[in-house]
Interface confidence: low
């Protein structure tokens, strides 16, 4: 019987209760490998989840997150709320980045501005909550009378 079961392809299961050894997976189920004794229930994408790929007889459905959320974990096992650029998600919801930090994405945490002076450079454009600082050439590299092409933006 084991030899016969191993002949059952993906999309079927080895049904010991029927004369036809390989039975197709029932609706809303799948088997991604051959020789399986049961088909797995298809994942349903509900609530904060939306369907990215429909379930087929040989592969599980894949979920994504609805607008305003982004995936976390393997196979998008959870959805986390988006924040705006310049914010990070805390236990109390979305909070603005503290001064000296930024976040240029809808997810993740606020990160410190680059310290230009560590590389011996000067700040060409000031940082904001949404953007990192832009470092320019070191003060010594600027010839007398030369000015930077972009004036520093006012800090927010």
């Amino acid at each position: 019987l084991q030899d016969l079961c191993s002949n059952c392809p993906a999309g079927t299961f080895c049904d010991n209760n029927r004369s036809q050894i390989c039975s197709p997976c029932p609706p809303n189920s799948f088997s991604s490998a051959g020789g399986q004794r049961t088909c797995d229930i298809c994942r349903q994408c509900k609530g904060v989840f939306k369907t990215r790929k429909e379930c087929s007889s040989t592969s599980n459905a894949e979920c994504d997150c609805i607008s305003g959320y982004h995936c976390l974990g393997a196979e998008c096992s959870m959805c986390e709320q988006d924040c705006k650029q310049g914010q990070e998600l805390t236990k109390k919801g979305c909070k603005d980045c503290c001064f000296g930090t930024f976040n240029d994405q809808k997810r993740g945490i606020c990160r410190p501005w680059t310290n230009c002076s560590l590389d011996g450079k000067s700040v060409l454009v000031n940082g904001t909550k949404e953007r990192d600082v832009v470092c320019g050439p070191s003060p010594a590299d600027l010839s007398p009378g030369a000015s930077s092409a972009t004036p520093p933006a006012p800090a927010r």
Partner: antibody
Framework: EVQLVESGGGLVQPGGSLRLSCAAS?????????WAWIRQAPGKGLEWVSS????????YYADSVKGRFTISRDNSKNTLYLQLNSLRAEDTAVYYC???????????????WGQGTLVTVSS | DIQLTQSPSSLSASVGDRVTITCRAS??????LAWYQQKPGKAPKLLIY???NLETGVPSRFSGSGSGTDFTLTISSLQPEDFATYYC????????FGQGTKVEIK
């Protein structure tokens, strides 16, 4: 008819461990419903603790138990487990096993409940 | 996480009264809300799922309504066996219960 029977509760000292079991009958735990543990401290409300998916092995935990509790199942025994480690006094509660009422990726409600098993954490 | 706030926390009513319990979610949860009844020493019993669907075997005097953030459980004519604690629960993102509403005899 779906029946859920919990066992494994008892008195344990702070820092100790327990393993709760939930034997399911009338339904396969590998079918497309979520399975959960929900607890209720004496005189308090209901608190969801942990869930495991029926279609795979995705697990979820409440922040209050993350890293201390582990949900698992034995398909051959049709039994759900909750391993409780590093127990604290605030973990004292009746622990219920429950089955989600839909095959949603996050089950929307709990249609079937066990009778509960009491865990008391005290020195 | 999504928080659910029930009101009132407790209420006193008489047999035959119309009773309304509300549940407010901290963010929109569509219709992914359920209501349970629990009596002392017993497991909770599902009454309503998907905000307004009556569970099989539950008397028709129980009804649920609402979507988004505001939900209501109504008992049209309170019966002696209805004195219990009622909980709402969301399944939109993980699982959360409200703190409960105790319905007592006046």
């Amino acid at each position: 008819e779906v029946q859920l029977v919990e066992s494994g509760g008892g008195l344990v000292q702070p820092g100790g461990s327990l393993r709760l079991s939930c034997a399911a009958s009338g339904y396969s735990i590998t079918s497309g419903h979520y399975w959960a543990w929900i607890r209720q401290a004496p005189g308090k409300g209901l608190e969801w603790v942990s869930s495991i998916s029926g279609y795979g092995s995705t697990t979820y935990y409440a922040d209050s138990v993350k890293g201390r509790f582990t949900i698992s199942r034995d398909n051959s025994k049709n039994t759900l487990y909750l391993q409780l480690n590093s127990l604290r006094a605030e973990d004292t509660a009746v622990y219920y096993c429950a089955r989600g009422g839909s095959d949603a990726v996050l089950g929307d409600w709990f249609a079937y409940w066990g009778q509960g098993t009491l865990v008391t954490v005290s020195s | 996480d999504i928080q659910l706030t029930q009101s009132p926390s407790s209420l006193s009513a008489s047999v035959g009264d119309r009773v309304t319990i509300t549940c407010r979610a901290s963010q929109g949860i569509g219709s992914f809300l359920a209501w349970y009844q629990q009596k002392p020493g017993k497991a909770p019993k599902l009454l309503i799922y998907d905000a307004s669907n009556l569970e099989t075997g539950v008397p028709s005097r129980f009804s649920g309504s609402g979507s988004g953030t505001d939900f209501t459980l109504t008992i049209s004519s309170l019966q002696p066996e209805d004195f219990a604690t009622y909980y709402c629960q969301q399944g939109y993102y993980l699982w959360t219960f409200g703190q409960g509403t105790k319905v007592e005899i006046k």
